[in-house]
Amino acid sequence: AAQPNNSLMLQTSKENHALASSSLCMDEKQITQNYSKVLAEVNTSWPVKMATNAVLCCPPIALRNLIIITWEIILRGQPSCTKAYKKETNETKETNCTDERITWVSRPDQNSDLQIRTVAITHDGYYRCIMVTPDGNFHRGYHLQVLVTPEVTLFQNRNRTAVCKAVAGKPAAHISWIPEGDCATKQEYWSNGTVTVKSTCHWEVHNVSTVTCHVSHLTGNKSLYIELLPVPGAKKSAKL
């Protein structure tokens, strides 16, 4: 059966409205299709940064071979949305689709790709292109994970104790310290799916004068350092 593998190609470009745009389409590596009518479904997990534009692609099948192209969109807490194009009548139809930022890239008879303009947290979900041919269906599915960059702050709150916070990230950031101290980490979950991570560390050893908080996140990593003073130091703030 048609079984493309899951190696990926990620393209990034700048659109003229200055939003970063990423397109996740199949890498051109795939196991040859035999003549079975059971055409395998391929699913990809795809992390995409919030506020960028995203383009999702269908399998590489020429329009002349198609009967119907359907995008099925399943977002949390919403009814399934479908966008369909029927070649014979050259008509498009939408069912339960309310988000105007999710559209065909252009006319579906010219380009079957789906685009999400200015990705938001609410776009977390499952997107599937279904290409109906006379001999069976080809599928390409995406589990879209929207990434939110946390705001990172580092401050000293009392003698030889520092607090590093990664606020409202998605998914949760990971905080580590150099050098290691006596640390406690808490996570606070918000209703929009973001997480604030707070790590509080204390250093008894007096020869430790500078400490570094390292925040690891899928959107990028950030390091901040602070000098341990007998009095609280100035607050530092940064975006990843």
């Epitope: 051109e28 299709q33 099948i61 002349r64 071979n65 006379p134 001999d135």
Partner: antibody, heavy 119, light 110 residues
Framework: QVQLVQSGAEVKKPGASVKVSCKAS????????MHWVRQAPGQGLEWMGY????????NYNEKFKGRVTMTRDTSTSTVYMELSSLRSEDTAVYYC????????????WGQGTLVTVSS | DIVLTQSPASLAVSPGQRATITCRAS??????????MHWYQQKPGQPPKLLIY???NLESGVPARFSGSGSGTDFTLTINPVEANDTANYYC????????FGQGTKVEIK
């Protein structure tokens, strides 16, 4: 297995027409687009057009429009390519080829039919 | 229409060596992350045989000595190492809506 068998060689006079057949077996005939390609002696491959047996759609190379007609007979799983107003430069081997869905690649070809145009 | 230009027109290679054929398209044949470029081998008296599809995918049953690469407008077919029975004509092809072939490259084994 998937197989395309073409009709035998033809000799035609200039101005005549020729109709080459391509019989398909081993798959659902109406499900796959069929292309026609020709190759003059010692020359390269030249795409002529295609027919989609599912809906009878055709698309021809501009060079052959008005002279070529592609048809299909679903009862015999056969596609036909008819070329009219033949001239000596139409002397060539004519191939049918089936297009596979994934990537629009042509994985199966007929054995070829030699058409000779000579007075 | 997209025009495909192959080079070189002919190529003589010793067994065990590498043969490289290039194909340049007059405009991009890549869309939605896929390059609709295929490579065929044709031996005298035979129909063409598919070697590579979508620029870099090896067709089932084709030896791994054959490989394809490229995207956009520039594509390459590589045979490494070349064997005696690789003597043939090789064609690049763009196949998506309107279909075109390169003019062919004749590969001879010394």
């Amino acid at each position: 297995q998937v197989q395309l068998v073409q009709s035998g060689a033809e000799v035609k006079k200039p101005g005549a027409s020729v109709k080459v057949s391509c019989k398909a077996s081993g798959y659902t005939f109406t499900s796959y687009v069929m292309h026609w390609v020709r190759q003059a002696p010692g020359q390269g491959l030249e795409w002529m057009g295609y027919i989609n047996p599912y809906n009878d759609d055709t698309n021809y190379n501009e060079k052959f429009k008005g002279r070529v007609t592609m048809t299909r007979d679903t009862s015999t799983s056969t596609v036909y390519m008819e070329l009219s107003s033949l001239r000596s430069e139409d002397t060539a081997v004519y191939y049918c080829a089936r297009e596979d869905y994934y990537g629009s690649r042509w994985g199966t070809w007929g054995q070829g039919t030699l058409v000779t145009v000579s007075s | 229409d997209i025009v495909l230009t192959q080079s070189p027109a002919s190529l003589a290679v010793s067994p065990g060596q590498r043969a490289t054929i290039t194909c340049r398209a007059s405009k991009s044949v890549s869309t939605s992350g896929y390059s609709y470029m295929h490579w065929y081998q044709q031996k005298p008296g035979q129909p063409p045989k598919l070697l590579i599809y979508l620029a870099s995918n090896l067709e089932s049953g084709v030896p791994a000595r054959f490989s394809g690469s490229g995207s956009g407008t520039d594509f390459t077919l590589t045979i490494n190492p070349v064997e005696a029975n690789d003597t043939a004509n090789y064609y690049c092809q763009h196949s998506h809506e309107l279909d075109t072939f390169g003019q062919g490259t004749k590969v001879e084994i010394k």
